[in-house]
């Protein structure tokens, strides 16, 4: 199957724009706009910090760690109430991301 110019292959995404919201003090919110052509049962999400089509249930049930959000070799843990996740580096440093 041939794709027309600007058409995305099923199950893929591309980044369109990247802008930052500085309205909330002490919090950095990066807004990345992506265009995705997701298959049935998938929605636009993230895998390894890149836009990707992911199983809709992962996001709806907030199972963030199933989206491979941490780097290879890092451990992923859900925050209380699944409000985000932490990535634990091999040496024990943690990086926390919250989802509003």
């Amino acid at each position: 199957q041939f794709l027309k110019e600007g058409q995305l292959a099923a199950g893929t995404c591309e980044i369109v724009t990247l802008d930052r919201d500085s309205s909330q003090p002490r919090r950095t919110i990066a807004r990345q706009t992506a265009r995705c052509a997701c298959r049935k049962g998938q929605i636009a999400g993230t895998t390894r910090a890149r836009p990707a089509c992911v199983d809709a249930r992962i996001i709806l049930q907030r199972w963030w760690c199933q989206m491979e959000l941490c780097l290879e070799g890092e451990g992923c843990d859900l925050l209380i109430n699944r409000s985000g996740w932490t990535c634990t580096q091999p040496g024990g440093r943690i990086k926390t991301t919250t989802v509003s």
């Epitope: 002490r26 950095t28 780097l71 925050l79 932490t86 634990t88 580096q89 091999p90 040496g91 024990g92 440093r93 943690i94 990086k95 926390t96």
Partner: antibody
């Protein structure tokens, strides 16, 4: 609002042991790491060490042995300093260490003098 | 031993000008991009400007731009303002399992002419 405040800094004599406390509010120490950083008068920033929940603290090579970082409650992290010398005179800061260090406490001044 | 070399140690700029500060690490930072930049004014704690080499922290002017990866990083301040007079520090993150977790550069003092 996320905040850190250091306390315990004072004038001490060489050889003294001193413990500084970093009290946090607005975020959970179970989800974030904290670093201690010091700055001698008119000098640059010097990283001392880092602690994350449920993990052993990590120290700068020069700080190992004389400095101890511990999480003492759900809202406090201590920095214990032994055998203080005049070279340890500095403002001591704690900071939430996540994607960069932010926010920082205002700092607490430790003066070591005979 | 981990080392972050910041150059120059001091720099002067006119209002409206552009300033470039360099930071070189003795080994690659974690994930090749875990480097932050801070601004510090006398009597105040440092303020985070940029993290992950190029991501602007909340509320920071877009006149501040970070770039680089691995061991070489740059902070560029464009359209310099009087309020930018301060000391700037780079801070690298390294794997805690093999070395010091963090290290700071020696600082660059910016004077506005």
């Amino acid at each position: 609002q996320e905040q850190l405040v250091e306390s315990g800094g004072r004038l001490v004599t060489p050889g003294t042991t001193l413990t500084l406390t970093c009290t946090v509010s607005g975020f959970s120490l179970s989800s974030y790491g904290v670093s201690w950083v010091r700055q001698a008068p008119g000098k640059g920033l010097e990283w001392i060490g880092y602690i994350a929940n449920n993990y052993n603290p990590h120290y700068a090579s020069w700080a190992k042995g004389r400095f101890t970082i511990s999480k003492t409650s759900s809202t406090t992290v201590d920095l214990k300093m032994t055998s203080l010398t005049t070279e340890d005179t500095a403002t001591y800061f704690c900071a939430r260490d996540n994607y960069g260090m932010d926010p920082w406490g205002p700092g607490t001044l430790v003066t070591v003098s005979s | 031993e981990l080392d972050l070399t910041q150059t120059p140690s001091s720099v002067s700029a006119a209002v409206g000008g552009t300033v470039t500060i360099n930071c070189q690490a003795s080994q690659s930072v974690y994930n090749n991009k875990n480097l932050a930049w801070y601004q510090q004014k006398p009597g105040q704690p440092p303020k985070l400007l940029i993290y992950a080499a190029s991501t602007l922290a909340s509320g920071v002017s877009s006149r501040f731009k970070g770039s680089g990866s691995g061991t070489q990083f740059t902070l560029t301040i464009s359209d310099v303002q009087c309020d930018d007079a301060a000391t700037y520090y780079c801070q690298g993150e390294f794997s805690c399992s093999s070395a010091d977790c963090n290290a700071f550069g020696g600082g660059t003092e910016l004077e506005i002419l």
